[in-house]
Amino acid sequence: SQPQAVPPYASENQTCRDQEKEYYEPQHRICCSRCPPGTYVSAKCSRIRDTVCATCAENSYNEHWNYLTICQLCRPCDPVMGLEEIAPCTSKRKTQCRCQPGMFCAAWALECTHCELLSDCPPGTEAELKDEVGKGNNHCVPCKAGHFQNTSSPSARCQPHTRCENQGLVEAAPGTAQSDTTCKNPLEPLPPEMSGTMLM
């Protein structure tokens, strides 16, 4: 079998064997090595010498196989834009940011650039659970049967109605989507407006 070409090697068709780790240098018509993540090009390749790579300095990074002559500067997560850090910048990866609790991503350009406060869900509703926290604004859905939610809140969940009998009590007023069941002592008389017809 033919020996594998090691960079730099000539390429007449403008393509390189290893698309991830090599790049085409059109002026010399050669394929050269890219630099691995966490490094940059400190000396460009020539017909007789391959790319020379160097490690990114502190507070800078390159995430992919590249032929950049500089490392990219680490950027902090901007709290003014509602972002918080979940993982620090390393030589191989930029700072990982997410929206602060109670916020969602309102502007996206490859990554979140701006977060805004989640909308409140009114009484009788709750925010639909999302696959990923902070990805979108709240979508409020009604509480399911037998549940209630009595505040305007971005995060309050619908709770099951109290079962009076579990507490040795009886129901005085049924629960709604916005209020819990009202219970009373079974020996207590009903309030006048709730009493049935009285037999004389």
């Epitope: 403008q14 393509t15 698309q19 991830e20 780790k21 790049y23 085409y24 890219r34 390159n62 995430e63 992919h64 196989w65 590249n66 032929y67 950049l68 002559t69 990219q72 490859l110």
Partner: nanobody
């Protein structure tokens, strides 16, 4: 995936001018070097002009002083202004971009220039 679409080719008289455009679309982000190549009838594809991510340009000797490569990063487009065209400039012109900060190389479908 990135798509490149060239336009601006056509039939022109010797001494005339044309401006080729190459627009990138799809998942186009990152840092790119941009190139124009051409393939004359029955010949190999050859490099015409380079626009690097650092703002440098370079040209094949045969087009120096006549062709100008430029780019509009906001529009994800690279241009080739061709003046004082000659019969030997007749070719299919291809746009090529190579991502610098990550793997990726893409070609346009080509646009025919006939002088």
């Amino acid at each position: 995936e990135v798509q490149l679409v060239e336009s601006g080719g056509g039939l022109v008289q010797p001494g005339g001018s044309l401006r080729l455009s190459c627009a990138a679309s799809g998942r186009f982000f990152g840092i790119y070097d941009m190139y124009w190549y051409r393939q004359p009838p029955g010949k190999q594809r050859e490099l015409v002009a380079i626009s690097t991510s650092g703002g440098h340009t370079n040209y094949a000797d045969s087009v120096k002083g006549r062709f100008t490569i430029s780019r509009d990063n906001a529009k994800n487009t690279v241009y080739l202004q061709m003046n004082s065209l000659r019969p030997e400039d007749t070719a299919v012109y291809y746009c090529n971009i190579q991502r610098v900060d990550a793997p990726g190389m893409y070609w346009g479908q080509g646009t025919l220039v006939t002088v």
